[in-house]
Amino acid sequence: LTCLGGFASPGPVPPSTALRELIEELVNITQNQKAPLCNGSMVWSINLTAGMYCAALESLINVSGCSAIEKTQRMLSGFCPHKVSAGQFSSLHVRDTKIEVAQFVKDLLLHLKKLFREGQFN
């Protein structure tokens, strides 16, 4: 039993589960939104799809003091293979194009649902 005990220990979360949890978090944010999300802060829009998780994190990491998206930021960091810090600017972003955080989160939710349906979990 001691040897078998290892099988019960929590291992890495499967990508499909992590994506589903991220989608659920974004659903919570969009459904529970009363006042303007993050005081109407603006973030960079994203124009491409490869490397999207890192680009999304790069956009949202620049929003500080917004507890509503802190969990989303943490979850996105799990999908991004490199360290992301505020001020980074990816080629994936549409330069000079910013949108409201609420719209970004809503759009991200739409996109992640598509990826989930298509079986693209990473």
Partner: nanobody
Framework: GVQLLESGGGLVQPGGSLRLSCAAS????????MGWVRQAPGKGLEWVSS????????YYADSVKGRFTISRDNSKNTLYLQMNSLRAEDTAVYYC???????????WGQGTLVTVSS
């Protein structure tokens, strides 16, 4: 907020060509399926064409198949409709719109008028 701004409409002779553009702003254009819808004078809305978010899948109404080509440039947040071999029956206001099944993701432009007449 969200904006879709069509341009490129105008008067053209039968058999001529036009290229419509739709500049998107205020939302994550690259993640949306997009489309074109038209409304002829005194008629209802008619779906013309749509394209998936990747740009790899395109769909056309039978009435425009082989004459119209939809495309997109996600780096420019722009949707296009190349219209060739235009006919009088293509005369309409052409609207750019998102093409999503999900409720709450429905955005439309103001439209651009295309008139095909000699």
């Amino acid at each position: 907020g969200v904006q879709l701004l069509e341009s490129g409409g105008g008067l053209v002779q039968p058999g001529g060509s036009l290229r419509l553009s739709c500049a998107a702003s205020g939302f994550s254009f690259a993640w949306y399926d997009m489309g074109w819808v038209r409304q002829a004078p005194g008629k209802g809305l008619e779906w013309v064409s749509s394209i998936d978010w990747k740009g790899g899948k395109t769909y056309y109404a039978d009435s425009v198949k082989g004459r119209f080509t939809i495309s997109r440039d996600n780096s420019k947040n722009t949707l296009y409709l190349q219209m060739n071999s235009l006919r009088a029956e293509d005369t309409a206001v052409y609207y750019c719109a998102t093409a999503e099944d999900e409720p709450g993701y429905d955005y439309w432009g103001q439209g651009t008028l295309v008139t095909v007449s000699s």
